[in-house]
């Protein structure tokens, strides 16, 4: 007789997720030579401990304290890049300004980019099927969790002039609710940030409205000053010549506005 | 953390007062103006940011005017068109750490009437 | 806007009683809130920032709790010198505000 399980609104465990981790792990590890002292099994046994046997809306950040612990890894503090709603843009940003990082340019970050997990209380099985979803069914969830954690540390860490992209195609250009807007603002360090820069990517040719002014954005800029950090903020109207200027800065084309 | 003194003023007045700090930098922490009526609770009026930015409460938008001088030390207030209701002690404050106003100035009268 | 309400208006306790005073935010404030005691004719003193924290060299006594949109400053085993009247303020953002203080509790204690 199948023992009864629980049923969740979210997707469940991504497939081959323990083979993803580890394989992940395994390319991470040879490709950033700081890192070469990690072993991933370690890594996978700690992070398999913060969710297995567990119920998946009782996850705490404790529980991620061990894989913290072994993914401990230094970043350039001033050469951080945030984002919100914009991911795939800041990763192509990073994978060309070689010497600012994401979160998921770190290996914690890296290790669950895209994937979702969760177990069952008392028993050692991964849950395929389904997990919770944030909203529907609950915030202590293991991938809600895992963000918030590494985002917290990931914040915590930064200094001088921090860097986030923001989607200016969105209604809201800075969410409240956001991993950005609900943890890694909050965690900014006011002794070490000096700055908070600000790219509003824009999303149509034609739109050359300055999405600096944005309620939402002069909200952000208000909720940053209270933490007595300052604040900058820059449109970036063609986010494709945007890119190309990274790759090839001397290009002619590149001193206009972008 | 210390405010210029107050004094009596007409309705219809132009209020200018200065606020002196030392011992912190303004490009380091805020400045929060804050009045106090007499018997009555707290009143936030508005806050001059490290990058120099200003905020105010929706009442005081029209009529106030805060500004800075990071070689003095200096925060001003500039409040027009006073009323009787402007009667207050005016508070300079530190914006400190998490926003919090840690550091208050004693305080100065002012007295808007006819 | 970031309203606050706090309750009660006023409240007395007896020596060695507890106060509890709360303070509601009217959208979430993310634990930006700091709690000020005031006595008359001085300016309120930092008790607690961040929610929580307590400030340099305030007594234990003093205790803040809450997240959100629901915070409360409790006063343990009250004692004369705690008479006066105790403020909240949102700390989160300084724009679109009517006012960032609650309207303040008066402590008597008998």
């Known amino acids: 007789v199948p023992r009864w399980r629980q049923q969740w609104s979210g997707p469940g465990t991504t497939k081959r997720f323990p083979e993803t981790v580890l394989a992940r792990c395994v390319k991470y590890t040879e490709i950033h030579p700081e890192m070469r002292h990690v072993d991933c099994q370690s890594v996978w046994d700690a992070f398999k401990g913060a969710f297995i046997s567990k119920h998946p809306c009782n996850i705490t950040e404790e529980d991620y304290q061990p894989l913290m612990k072994l993914g401990t890894q230094t970043v350039p503090c001033n050469k951080i890049l945030l984002w919100s709603r914009i991911k795939d843009l800041a990763h192509q940003f990073t994978q060309v300004q070689r010497d600012m990082f994401t979160l998921e340019d770190t290996l914690l970050g890296y290790l669950a980019d895209d994937l979702t997990w969760c177990g069952e209380f008392n028993t050692s099985k991964i849950n395929y099927q389904s997990c919770p979803d944030w909203r529907k069914d609950c915030s202590n969830n293991p991938v809600s969790v895992f963000w918030k954690t590494v985002s917290r540390r990931f914040a915590e860490a930064a200094c001088d002039v921090v860097h986030v992209m923001l989607n200016g195609s969105r209604s809201k250009i800075f969410d409240k609710n956001s991993t950005f807007g609900s943890v890694e603002v909050h965690n900014l360090q006011p002794e070490k940030v000096q700055t908070l820069e600000a790219w509003v990517i824009h999303g149509g040719r034609e739109d050359s409205r300055d999405l600096c002014q944005d309620p939402t954005i002069k909200e952000l800029e208000s909720i940053i000053s209270k933490r007595n950090i300052q604040f900058s903020c820059k449109n970036i109207y063609r986010p494709d010549k945007f890119l190309q200027c990274v790759k090839n800065p001397e290009d002619s084309s590149c001193t206009s506005e972008i | 953390v210390k405010e210029s003194e107050g004094g009596l003023f007409k309705p219809t007045d132009t209020l200018t007062l200065t606020c002196t700090v030392s011992?912190?930098?303004?490009?380091?922490?805020?400045v929060i103006w804050v009045r106090q009526a007499p018997g009555k609770g707290l009143e936030y009026i508005g806050f001059v940011a490290v990058g120099g930015t200003t905020y105010y409460a929706n009442w005081a938008k029209s009529r106030s005017t805060i500004t800075r001088n990071t070689n003095e030390n200096t925060v001003t207030l500039k409040m027009t068109s006073l009323t009787a209701a402007d009667t207050a002690t005016y508070f300079c404050?530190?914006?400190?750490?998490?926003?919090?106003?840690?550091?208050w100035g004693p305080g100065t009268l002012v007295t808007v009437s006819s | 806007a970031y309203d606050m309400t706090q309750t009660p208006a006023s409240v007395s306790e007896p020596v060695g009683g507890t106060v509890t005073i709360k303070c509601q935010a009217s959208?979430?404030?993310?634990?930006?809130l700091s709690w000020y005691q005031q006595k008359l004719g001085q300016p309120p003193k930092l008790l607690i920032y961040s929610a929580s924290t307590l400030a340099s060299g305030v007594s234990s006594r003093f205790k803040g709790s809450g997240s959100g949109t629901e915070y409360t400053l409790t006063i343990s085993g009250v004692e004369c010198a705690d008479a006066a009247t105790y403020y909240c303020?949102?700390?989160?953002?300084?724009?679109?505000?009517?006012?960032?203080f609650g309207g303040g509790t008066e402590v008597v204690v008998k």
């Open positions: 404050v530190r914006n400190g750490v998490s926003g919090s106003s840690d550091i």
């Open positions: 959208q979430s404030i993310y634990s930006y």
């Open positions: 303020q949102q700390d989160y953002s300084g724009s679109n505000v009517d006012n960032t």
């Open positions: 011992g912190f930098s303004l490009s380091s922490y805020g």
